[in-house]
């Protein structure tokens, strides 16, 4: 016959059925079956089936009355073209019926990778996503979701083009990739954590440096009124959003930040978008940036902070080396430190007089005197961006009589 | 056969929460995301969210966040919906949908009325 | 959000006349969805990605359009297919639907 041939799919290890439309009163002679290769099967009414094909023993079925062909647990070898030729009773053309069968393998969870991310002085970004799935051939059709009209698809859809700003909300991109027998869709990504890097465009931006201390609040002020174009602000730590503040109440990203009092920590202030954070901890340091976001335009405004958290500094505590004599001269070197001041804390002594000489980021005193002279008792305070702290050592008699003359 | 079988009508008071269930067949349950749809009284089809059953991934449309909340049993191929808080305003039929980028099969829905 | 405007909201048609239902989006879509609900059912895909017919749909079911503006025909209105029909977009989330359009048989 001339018409193209019936086109049939399956799917690996599965089974198919080649249909033939014989109705139940037609009279058969026989049905001869031919494979990609030869001559399969033969079949005659009340008789039982002749496989002629090794392969497909056990595999091959022909039904009654219709004498569709069945192939179970099919293989990538049985695709290709199937012909039923059809006698019937005390008719002399032999009709044919033609098919071809596809098999196709059931795909696996395609999986999404990011193959490139371009920063653009405008802090909007070009995010290139690929979508594959593991052993699939090339009758595999990808399509995304959400299918955004200024997204670009290419090698087939497995390819994704997306440009956005810090502004634009995280979306979760789904990748589906469909055979003629399965479909399957990947995890959702999220695209939003690689385009909240103001640095990778241009260097890293200096902006205001606030000083926090730690355990209480800061506010890092942004200083500036919303109007009824501005959309939202998107305030980011590193990399990672931490608040998109959309004209009302801040919804903190549930993606990265904890639930419960964690989320209630870091706020934005109804009036004019600053950060707050309550209870600083020492991990809060670093930098911060404000994404001003309107509505008039894609590009946003972006304001720049360092968040620096000191220790409030408790009160240091002095210790004296022992005492060393010579020639009437007493020597002792007094030193002033803070439990866990960090490494940002300076020491000033009092009084200074050419007898008292600091040393070592001053926190060291070297005194030196004569026997028996009086000395003055010597206060030390230490100092950092949020604190000072003081403590006075008593000199009384450290060096008063012969007993002392030795180390 | 493919399937979505949702559970039946539910009358509850407003404050309450619901649990609405939606059984998958004929298909392999993790490979598709599953949708919940809202449809109040006369009115047309909104969206609430999915729920991706091979991970337990979600995502909420802005107006359902503190009022759904999506699960999925893997091992009986079933996606719930929990709504919490109800009023008479969530008096609707709800559907769960198969799909990402257009819904291709549709539960019966769950009619939800709210009353005290 | 995406909002789409289907219409009319309600209309009428005599068996093997022509129907047109519109759908128009606030802002630019890549595809468009649309479904058929009857009263007491869920809605049924009838075609996706714009064009394409989903499996079972009648040939006389066609859809079409680009950008922001985009049609469901029927080439020949039949007793079955009074019902209320939606178009639907996921170009971004949410995925929204429009009103629906309420198809009656004259």
């Known amino acids: 016959k001339d018409s193209a041939p019936t086109v049939v799919s399956g799917i690996l290890g599965g089974s198919v059925t080649l249909p033939l439309n014989i109705s139940v009163d037609t009279e058969i002679e026989n049905v001869i079956w031919i494979g990609p290769k030869n001559a399969l099967a033969f079949a005659r009414p009340k008789e039982n089936v002749t496989i002629m094909v090794k392969s497909y023993l056990g595999r091959l079925d022909i039904t009654k009355w219709s004498y569709s062909l069945c192939i179970s647990n099919l293989t990538l070898n049985d695709a290709g073209s199937y012909k039923a030729q059809i006698n019937q009773r005390n008719f002399e053309v032999t009709t044919e019926e033609e098919f071809t069968l596809f098999v196709y393998e059931q795909l696996q969870e395609p999986q999404v990778t990011m193959k490139s991310v371009k920063v653009s002085e405008n802090f909007s970004c070009n995010i290139t996503l690929m979508c594959s799935v593991k052993g699939a051939e090339k009758s595999v059709l990808y399509s995304w979701t959400p299918r955004e009209p200024h997204a670009s698809e290419s090698n087939g859809g497995s390819i994704l083009t997306v440009s956005r700003t810090p502004c634009d909300p995280d979306l979760p991109y789904i990748c589906t990739a469909q055979n003629p027998v399965s479909q399957r869709s990947s995890l959702p990504v999220h695209v939003g954590q690689f385009c909240t890097d103001p640095g990778a465009s241009r260097g890293t931006a200096a902006g205001k440096t606030v000083v926090g201390i730690l355990g209480e609040p800061v506010t890092l002020p942004l200083e500036f009124r919303a109007t009824r174009a501005t959309k939202n602000v998107v305030w980011v730590f590193n990399t990672s959003v931490i608040s998109q503040e959309r004209r009302g109440a801040a919804t903190a990203d549930s993606r990265r930040k904890p639930k419960g009092s964690e989320e209630r920590r870091v706020r934005t202030s109804d009036q004019d978008q600053s950060l707050k954070i309550s209870q600083l901890k020492m991990e809060d340091a670093g930098p911060y940036h404000a994404y001003v976001c309107s509505e008039a335009s894609r590009d946003p405004s972006v304001r720049h902070f360092t968040l620096l958290v000191y220790k409030r500094l408790e009160k240091p505590s002095v210790t004296k080396s022992p005492v060393h004599m010579m020639n009437g001269i007493c020597e002792v070197v007094l030193t002033c430190s803070v439990d866990g001041g960090g490494n940002n804390v300076t020491y000033t002594w009092m009084p200074l007089q050419n007898k008292a000489v600091m040393s070592q980021g001053k926190s060291h005193l070297n005194v030196s005197w004569e026997s028996g002279e009086h000395l003055p008792n010597f206060t030390c305070t230490a100092h950092n961006p949020v604190s000072n702290s003081s403590s006075q050592f008593s000199s009384g008699t450290i060096c008063s009589g012969p007993e002392r003359n030795k180390r | 056969q493919m399937q979505l079988q949702e559970s039946g009508p539910e009358l509850v008071k407003p404050g309450a929460s619901v649990k609405i269930s939606c059984k998958a067949s004929g298909y392999t349950f993790t490979h598709y995301y599953i949708n919940w749809v809202q449809q109040r009284p006369g009115q047309g089809l909104e969206w609430i969210g999915w729920?991706?059953?091979?991970?337990?991934?979600?995502y909420y449309s802005e107006k359902f966040k503190a009022k759904a909340t999506l699960t999925v049993d893997k091992s009986s191929s079933t996606a719930y919906m929990l709504l919490s808080s109800l009023t008479s305003e969530d008096s609707a039929v709800y559907f769960c949908?198969?799909?990402?980028?257009?819904?291709?099969?549709w539960g019966q829905g769950t009619t939800l009325t709210v009353s005290s | 959000q995406i909002v789409l405007t289907q219409s009319p909201a309600i209309m009428s048609a005599s068996p093997g006349e022509k129907v047109t239902v519109t759908c128009s989006a606030s802002?630019?879509?890549?595809?468009m969805f649309w479904y058929q609900q009857k009263p007491g059912f869920s809605p049924r895909l009838l075609i996706y990605d714009t064009s394409n017919l989903a499996s079972g749909v009648p040939v006389r079911f066609s859809g079409s359009g680009s950008g922001t503006s985009y049609s469901l025909t029927i080439s020949r209105m039949e007793a079955e297919d009074a019902a209320t029909y939606y178009c639907q977009q996921w170009s971004s989330y949410p995925p929204t639907f429009g009103g629906g359009t309420k198809l009656e048989i004259k």
């Open positions: 729920i991706f059953p091979e991970s337990g991934s979600t």
């Open positions: 949908a198969r799909g990402t980028g257009f819904f291709d099969y």
């Open positions: 802002s630019s879509v890549s595809y």
